[in-house]
């Protein structure tokens, strides 16, 4: 190899060892009967050398540094050449470095031809191995602007007082052009300006100077985003830290065309703007830091640009001003992550504060819009608390558990609407009366409606789930001893059409001791399946539940249990079941931890089934499933 550098070229070539390889014998640069591991060639020198091995790229790297002095004479502006040409260099990983020194008052602009640049964070690498490392200068201090790959949105970087640009090319890369030019500009009066151009939908992740280390004290950095007018941009902060400020406040400022409040100032912890049409600027302003404990300011953020959806221009009013103790959350439904670009899906408050989830609280009227390609990616979860603190005031009082129409009119699917029903302990109980009788969901007879009610205890220490119930069954009412949550969960978009079938009334009633009482009025010709609460986990210990089963005058009810034994093993106490005729009060008592379960039995009159649990040993729980079937009373079976 021969490398000759012209005089006055201000180029230095350095060949040195790269990352150690443990799989190859040492290799040397051989030059006039000497073997060396570092070779420096300066302007005006011509050196002939060889390598002592076949694959020097496994051992050595080459750095070509050109110093460009804009202090003492005119600056060589325009397209930057790769000198010496890559064809004249040994095939090693190469780094071309341009070090431009300029006066503080002179702005320097790096312009990147297509493909533009994409900033990468610490620990990331570029797929093709080509990286651009750009740094600036504040007095004598070097400031890292960032490391960039190809195929991005960054088209220009403006700095002042000097710039250092390092282009790293892997040994096998055929690139023979720098891909950028330098132009002079007037002073930019800040650390740097990064221009990011979007041609269409896409995203860009950008970072403050020196990231992940601290942004220079009291500095200003600006990003200019060029976005086609028909697209919308949203900003989200992925990661940030604040330093300890002595004077001034760290902030971001947006210049948004058309805004009457430019610049719009935000704290870093604020929700950042979304749904912005066209170009905008974002600036990061540091502060004077506390000398003793400065901390660090750093910011990593993402700009997402996408088509406005039809929904993004529609404003929905959610009037919760007459509601109390209610919160509505719109959030992404869980999905498997895909590797391809997925446009953002945001919900916006007052059209500007957009985020992937939003919680609205009662007592106000809210205006929301959506910036989302597919609203099925979002769902709604609502929580409302109905509580009674004074039992004298609440007794016999009723509340309708219905989804407000404002919520049903939103273009987002309702997932859960939960009512937390709270009563004073040992003073009142609750009764749920559905508009349409309910069916309990079982494996034998699953619910196939578009929604169900999930009923569970709302006492933190109590793990008690009464079950899932849907319209179209035989359960006329459910009485519960104490606090519960009732969740209307939807399973299909057709809920909107079936919404009229929802309707549940809760009333506060005098306190009773049983955990739950189900009133069942079976219809003829249909088998009613019923099961104990907490199916699969077992009825909680020492818990008692009852079923009040009505039998019409002209019918007979067949009560059938679906296993021979209950399977419960008691640690303390006894588990038992009482079947009691309501008219005669005649009752049969079964020891569930000892006896076999009764064979199918026939009942001519309404009857009770009461199941009370012991304290079972773990793994031997009490789970019972039974059915009730009505048949016409044609023969006197007695």
């Amino acid at each position: 190899f021969e490398i000759a550098l012209p005089r006055e070229s201000n180029i230095t070539v350095l060949i040195k060892l790269g990352t150690p390889t443990l799989l190859a014998k040492p290799c040397y640069i051989v030059i006039s009967k000497r073997h060396i591991t570092m070779l420096s060639i300066k302007s005006g020198e011509r050196i002939v050398f060889t390598f002592s091995c076949q694959s020097p790229e496994n051992h050595f790297v080459i750095e070509i540094q050109k110093n460009i002095d804009c202090m003492s004479g005119p600056c060589p502006f325009g397209e930057v050449q790769l000198q010496p040409s890559t064809s004249l260099l040994p095939t090693l990983n190469r780094t071309f470095i341009w070090d431009v020194k300029a006066h503080k008052s002179i702005g320097l602009e790096l312009q990147f031809s297509i493909p533009r640049l994409r900033q990468i964070g610490p620990g990331e690498s570029c797929p093709d191995g080509v990286t651009h490392s750009i740094s600036g200068r504040i007095d004598a201090t070097v400031v890292r602007i960032g490391t960039f790959c190809s195929n991005g949105t960054v088209s220009r970087i403006k700095m002042q007082e000097g710039v250092k640009m390092a282009l790293h090319l892997p040994w096998f890369h055929p690139r023979n052009v720098s891909g950028f030019s330098i132009a002079n500009r007037s002073s930019i009066k800040r650390l740097c300006i990064i221009e990011s151009v979007f041609e269409g939908e896409g995203s860009a992740t950008l970072m403050s100077a020196n990231y992940p280390e601290g942004f220079p004290e009291d500095e200003l950095m600006t990003w200019q985003f060029v976005v086609p007018a028909h697209l919308r941009a949203s900003v989200s902060f992925l990661n940030f830290n604040l330093s300890n400020c002595e004077r001034k406040e760290e902030r971001v400022e947006y210049y948004i065309p058309g805004s009457t409040t430019n610049p719009e100032v935000f704290k870093l912890e604020d929700k950042q703007p979304g749904n912005m049409a066209g170009n905008f600027n974002l600036s990061l302003q540091g502060c004077d830091q506390d000398a003793q404990s400065p901390g660090i300011l750093r910011l990593q953020f993402q700009v997402l640009v996408q088509h406005p959806q039809n929904e993004s221009n529609k404003i929905y009013v959610v009037d919760l001003s007459n509601e109390r103790a209610m919160s509505l959350t719109i959030e992404p439904r869980p999905v498997k992550q895909s590797r391809k670009f997925v446009p953002g899906c945001f919900v916006c408050l007052e059209s500007r504060t957009c985020s992937s989830n939003l919680t609205l609280t009662s007592g106000s009227k809210h205006k929301i819009s959506f910036l989302c390609d597919d609203l099925t990616r979002l769902w709604m979860n609502v929580e409302k608390t109905i509580s009674c603190t004074d039992h004298r005031y609440c007794q016999r009082k009723s509340y309708s558990l219905q989804v407000p129409s404002d919520i049903l009119h939103l273009p987002v699917e309702l997932h859960d609407f939960s009512w937390k029903l709270l009563v004073p302990k040992d003073r009142l109980s609750l009764v749920l009366v559905p508009a349409q009788k309910l069916q309990q969901h079982t494996h034998e007879k699953p619910c196939n409606t578009s929604f169900s009610y999930l009923v569970a205890s709302a006492i933190p220490s109590q793990d008690l789930y009464f079950g899932s119930f849907c319209p179209g069954g035989s359960i006329k009412q459910i009485q519960v001893k104490q606090n519960i949550s009732v969740t209307l969960r939807t399973f299909a978009p057709s809920f909107q059409q079936e919404a009229s079938r929802q309707g549940l009334t809760v009333s506060f009633i005098p306190y009773f001791k049983e955990e739950g009482v189900f009133t069942v009025t079976p219809d003829t010709k249909s088998k009613v399946y019923l099961r104990t609460p907490n199916w699969d986990r077992g009825l909680p210990s020492l818990t008692s539940v009852s079923w009040n089963i009505s039998v019409p005058r002209d019918q007979v009810a067949c009560l059938t249990f679906f296993k021979e034994r209950s399977g419960v093993v008691c640690q303390t106490g006894r588990a038992f079941m009482i079947i009691q005729e309501q008219r005669t009060r005649a009752e049969e008592i079964f020891s569930l931890d000892e006896d076999v379960l009764p064979k199918p039995s026939f009942h001519h009159h309404s009857f009770w089934v009461n199941i009370s649990n012991c304290s079972p040993t773990s793994g031997k729980q009490l789970d019972l499933l039974f059915s009730v079937t009505l048949t016409p009373r044609t023969v006197d079976l007695t």
């Epitope: 040195k16 790269g18 150690p20 190859a24 014998k25």
Partner: antibody, heavy 118, light 106 residues
Amino acid sequence: EVQLQQFGAELVKPGASVKISCKASGYSFSDFNIEWLKQSHGKSLEWIGDINPNYDSTNYNQKFKGRATLTVDKSSSTAYMEVRSLTSEDTAVYYCARLGYGYAMDYWGQGTSVTVSS
Amino acid sequence: IVMTQSPQSMSMSVGERVTLSCKASENVGAYVSWFQQKPDQSPKLLILAASNRYTGVPARFIGSGSATDFTLTISSVQAEDLADYHCGQSYTYPYTFGGGTKLEIK
């Protein structure tokens, strides 16, 4: 098995010369440099120089340049170091080592003790 | 390139964690080796390329660092680890070594 064999001890008079040998075995002698190092009593290691048997090329520490000469005999896979104009300051143990993978001195001779005394 | 080792000597009990430091006056990449030299023996290679354990070296010897700051850690020192420890750079000529650290066992 890679081995570097050095002979035990040399007693020489001030002003004289000494030639120390280092016989390599168990690998291809031409593929790796031989490094020479000095260790005075109770002191750390000091690099004298190295030789590339393939190119017969040498590098020296400036401190020893002109007084130390490194050579090799490829036929016997032996490296030599000659030090001239010895003084009491040259009393030390001299090691040869192979510069192996990762540019690390992976195999060492047992050292030759040189005592310069009248 | 000047290599500076610290401390010059240290006395540790069996089972303790030992950290030896080696600083280079200039960037030497990862071309630093660590050697163990027991009394009246030649040095033995422990760590090559800053962090790679040499064949047969016990796992308690751990090398780390790059550029100018390097560390040899012995996670749980044993009686047989009594020795001098040297670091050296082979990034550029002339190759240089630190002054060594003498490890004594209490």
